[in-house]
């Protein structure tokens, strides 16, 4: 059962796993959620009745019954992890804590104009977990405006104390606000020879990379495959770091793979969700339960529904045994990974999908794309919406993209002459415009947020957000698309599609069926030559065929330029402007979404 509220002046007795320090009970709950075993916690707030050394302690707890006896204690705040909840979870914490000094290893000290600048510095520093900033009112003159970047083994402070005129906060890497590079490549036959901060067992290099990503100290990793010559090291995932933040030595070694933490790309690729099945593989660990199950998929469901289950091994039924049901072994360990991985025993293993809700919904695989043709099929572009105006009569106005359960990203120029959000309707999960009838359900628009630097499409800043009156329940036909990571600025996208119900040629009419066209990106330099009367800025991106014939057109405005990268779809552009439609040598110009990620997050995460 999902319990989100905090229990004031209440302490859970027993079940302690570990104690960490957090600046608030709310953040203690997040830490508990992300810990592999924590189900409950007790936080101690600052209070005159409480020993100051116990202030800000966050005791992480576990219980076989998923609950613990409650005891009354002043200044104690207790609660449950969000593991038991189905809603989206984020580790993003933008709070600034006044008069708190969060202790850790002070590895970098510099002058900063403000706490915000200090936080940005922490966010863009590969080692930084949190910071403390001495304000200009700080008593000691030589420490004023000093920004201390800090890290710890756990990513949380080693202690928190009261200190006047300082502020503290966390890195915003988990808010997708880091400018650090996102290096997704996995390097075969490579060992990174740097210090190990931890080691876990993993079935493949991808899982190893994802574990590295959500380990606070891991910057890169080396994985020894099951063919690795040294038997004791097979399936070993070594989590590594270095002072420079990069591997100091790369050694060529067969059957080893290495890669980097994906912390700067975590909002656009799955890092918690290990959804694959591993055949002829047994995961060893503490046994939670043994249940009969029809298939390994059913076994994974059972594991996902059991809040303490972290991974499983399914042994298929022997012929005609137990009504064709096999054995499903639900398991757990102290760190969420198997204690050993064995091959050749016929088992099928995998992980709980409970952690998938810690990943962005947009990373979920959608059904395979239909190749060829220009008409889309249902569920092919589940983030695409049709935005209608009801004034003077109802009609399709623009396209848009679902980027959150209450947010649509579209183009600012769509709202020329739109006086009020009341005349707008957003339809999702639509393939044919003819499906839209009087009684078709839609989302009302609560607010139109237009970029305040927008003047005209051709000058840039052609971006707008629609805040919906109600939330979108994600299904196969309506779900979000990922925003590109700021760390992905240098990615060369090769699989890009423009979609919309717009005209197929100039002086045409709106199409009934959602149209799609695969179009290549064009460099800004090349694009600038085609549009000598307009500045093609870095905040714009161009796409279109040399020979023309495929392009966005009137009515596609605001819709997505969607590019697939590493099996995940990203909203790379918003259809903005261009010369005619599919004009030869005149590429379409799109708003370059990666340049507006900060703006989008600022507007959508505003309290």
């Amino acid at each position: 059962e999902c319990v989100t509220q905090l229990l004031k002046d209440t302490c859970f007795e027993g079940g302690d796993i570990t104690t960490v320090f957090t600046p608030s009970a709310k953040y203690c709950q997040v830490v508990c959620t992300y810990h592999p075993r924590c189900l409950l916690f007790t936080f101690t707030a600052e209070s005159p009745s409480e020993d100051p050394t116990r202030w800000f302690t966050c005791v992480l707890k576990d219980s076989v019954t998923e609950t613990l006896p409650r005891v009354n204690r002043t200044a104690a705040i207790s609660g449950y992890s969000f593991k038991q909840c189905s809603h989206q979870i984020s580790a993003c914490n933008k709070d600034i804590y006044v008069d708190l000094d969060m202790k850790g290893i002070n590895y970098n000290s510099s002058v900063a104009k403000s706490a915000q600048e200090c936080q940005e510095r922490c966010t863009d520093d590969v080692h930084c977990h949190f910071f403390t900033y001495a304000t200009r009112q700080f008593p000691s003159l030589e420490h004023r405006n000093i920004c201390l970047l800090k890290h710890t083994q756990t990513g949380t402070p080693t202690r928190i104390t009261k200190l006047d005129k300082v502020v503290s906060g966390f890195s915003l890497k988990s808010c997708a606000l880091s400018n650090l590079a996102c290096i997704r490549d996995i390097f075969p036959n490579t060992v990174f020879a740097d210090s190990n901060i931890d080691s876990v067992m993993a079935p493949d290099a991808f899982v190893c990379g994802r574990i590295c990503t959500h380990h606070p100290g891991c910057l890169f990793f080396t994985f020894f495959s099951q063919e690795w010559p040294k038997e004791s090291q097979r399936n070993l995932c070594l989590l590594k770091t270095s002072e420079s933040g990069l591997p100091s030595t790369r050694i060529k070694k067969s059957k080893a793979l290495s890669g980097f933490s994906l912390q700067s790309c975590r909002h656009s690729i799955p890092v918690f969700c290990h959804s694959s099945f591993y055949h002829d593989t047994d995961f060893l660990g503490e046994e939670l339960d043994i249940v009969a199950a029809k298939s390994h998929e059913a076994c994974q469901k059972l594991c996902t529904n059991a809040v303490r289950c972290q991974f499983f091994t399914y042994t298929p039924a022997q012929a005609s045994c137990n009504e064709g049901k096999g054995k499903c072994y639900l398991k757990l360990s102290s760190n969420g990974s198997p204690t050993k991985i064995l091959h050749g025993r016929g088992g099928i293993s995998g992980y709980t999908l409970r952690l998938c809700k810690m990943d962005n919904e947009c990373t979920t695989k959608i059904k395979p794309r239909i190749v060829g043709g220009t008409a889309s099929v249902r569920g092919e572009w589940p983030w695409q919406v049709t935005l209608h105006t009801t004034s003077p009569t109802q009609r399709h106005l623009c396209g848009g993209s679902i980027i959150g359960n209450q947010w649509i990203l579209t183009a600012a120029h769509c709202f020329y002459g739109v006086e009020s959000p009341k005349i707008l309707r957003v339809y999702s999960g639509i393939l044919n415009q003819s499906e839209i009838k009087e009684d078709t359900s839609f989302f009302g628009v609560q607010e139109i947020i237009i970029h305040d630097q927008y003047k005209m499409a051709e000058s840039g800043y052609d971006i707008a957000l629609l805040k919906l009156e109600t939330t979108v329940n994600y299904t196969d036909s309506q779900r979000p698309i990922c925003l590109p990571s700021k760390g992905d600025r240098n990615v060369i996208y090769t699989d890009c599609w423009v979609t919309g119900w717009g005209y197929r040629k100039l002086r045409d009419k709106i199409q009934n069926t959602l149209q799609k066209a695969k179009i290549p990106l064009v460099t800004n330099e090349e694009c600038q030559k085609r549009y000598r009367g307009h500045k093609i800025t870095h905040k714009m991106i161009c796409a279109g065929y040399r020979e023309g014939g495929k392009d966005a057109c009137k009515g596609d405005s605001g819709g997505p330029l969607s590019c697939k990268h590493n099996e995940v779809w990203h909203l790379v552009g918003i259809t903005s402007w261009g010369e005619g439609c599919a004009q030869r040598e005149r590429p379409g110009v799109y708003t370059n979404v990666v340049e507006y990620v900060d703006w989008i997050l600022e507007k959508t995460q505003a309290v």
Epitope: E458, S459, K529, R530, R532, G533, E579, E585, R586
Partner: antibody, heavy 120, light 107 residues
């Protein structure tokens, strides 16, 4: 009907500057580009640059980047081309033209031309 | 910059005969080619845009053809008022560039 009317002929000394105006009428001034092209006596056509009156964006031929300045006053639908540090080989007829396409294309309407003579 | 080379430099054709002017681009310019007519003391006048589209009011004896790097302006039946200098222009890539011009006279 669309018209581009340019200012009268100019005689300048080397090193001086000249400013030619081009008044547009008969269409929405901010919806089209204004290009500037020159033609030396007995020679072909040479593009100087373009201004987008809607945004004020300018784009110059590398050969004129340091000496030409294009401006527009949308309140009176007039574009200007100023050429500084004049040399004798700048003697030419200077034309303004409107582009056929909104974003740059063939030039469908031309001014009558302004003769600029540079002589000491 | 893209160089547009026109040929011939001058051409004399009898009234009622066909006149053909060629233009070669130093690289592919797709369909972004226009043709202009200029009479003495006048500004150029647009005849053809996008290789083969006749501009409003241009007589149908003027036609354009070609692709890639080679383009042609054809006057199917020369009239006395067609005596002028003709220029091709590429608009494919900035800066736009013009051919050197072809002087058309009556033989």
């Amino acid at each position: 009907q669309v018209q581009l009317v340019q200012s009268g002929a100019e005689v300048k000394k080397p090193g001086a500057s000249v400013k030619v105006s081009c008044k547009a009428s008969g269409y929405t001034f901010t919806n089209y580009l204004i290009e500037w092209v020159r033609q030396a006596p007995g020679q072909g056509l040479e593009w100087i640059g373009v201004i987008n009156p809607g945004s004020g964006y300018t784009n110059y031929n590398e050969n004129f980047k340091d000496r030409a300045t294009l401006t527009a006053d949308t309140s009176i639908s007039t574009a200007y081309m100023e050429l500084s540090r004049l040399r004798s080989d700048d003697t030419a007829v200077y034309f303004c033209a409107r582009t056929y396409g909104k974003y740059g294309g063939a030039m469908d309407f031309w001014g009558q031309g302004t003769t600029v003579t540079v002589s000491s | 910059d893209i160089v547009m080379t026109q040929s011939p430099d001058s051409l004399a054709v009898s009234l009622g005969e066909r006149a053909t002017i060629n233009c070669k681009a130093s690289q592919s310019v797709s369909n972004d080619v226009a043709w202009y007519q200029q009479k003495p003391g006048q500004p150029p006048k647009l005849l053809i845009y996008y290789i083969s589209n006749r501009y409003t009011g241009v007589p149908d004896r003027f036609s354009g053809s070609g692709s890639g790097t080679d383009f042609t302006l054809t006057i199917s039946s020369l009239q006395a008022e067609d005596v002028a200098v003709y220029y091709c222009q590429q608009d494919y890539s900035s800066p736009p560039t013009f051919g050197g011009g072809t002087k058309l006279e009556i033989k």
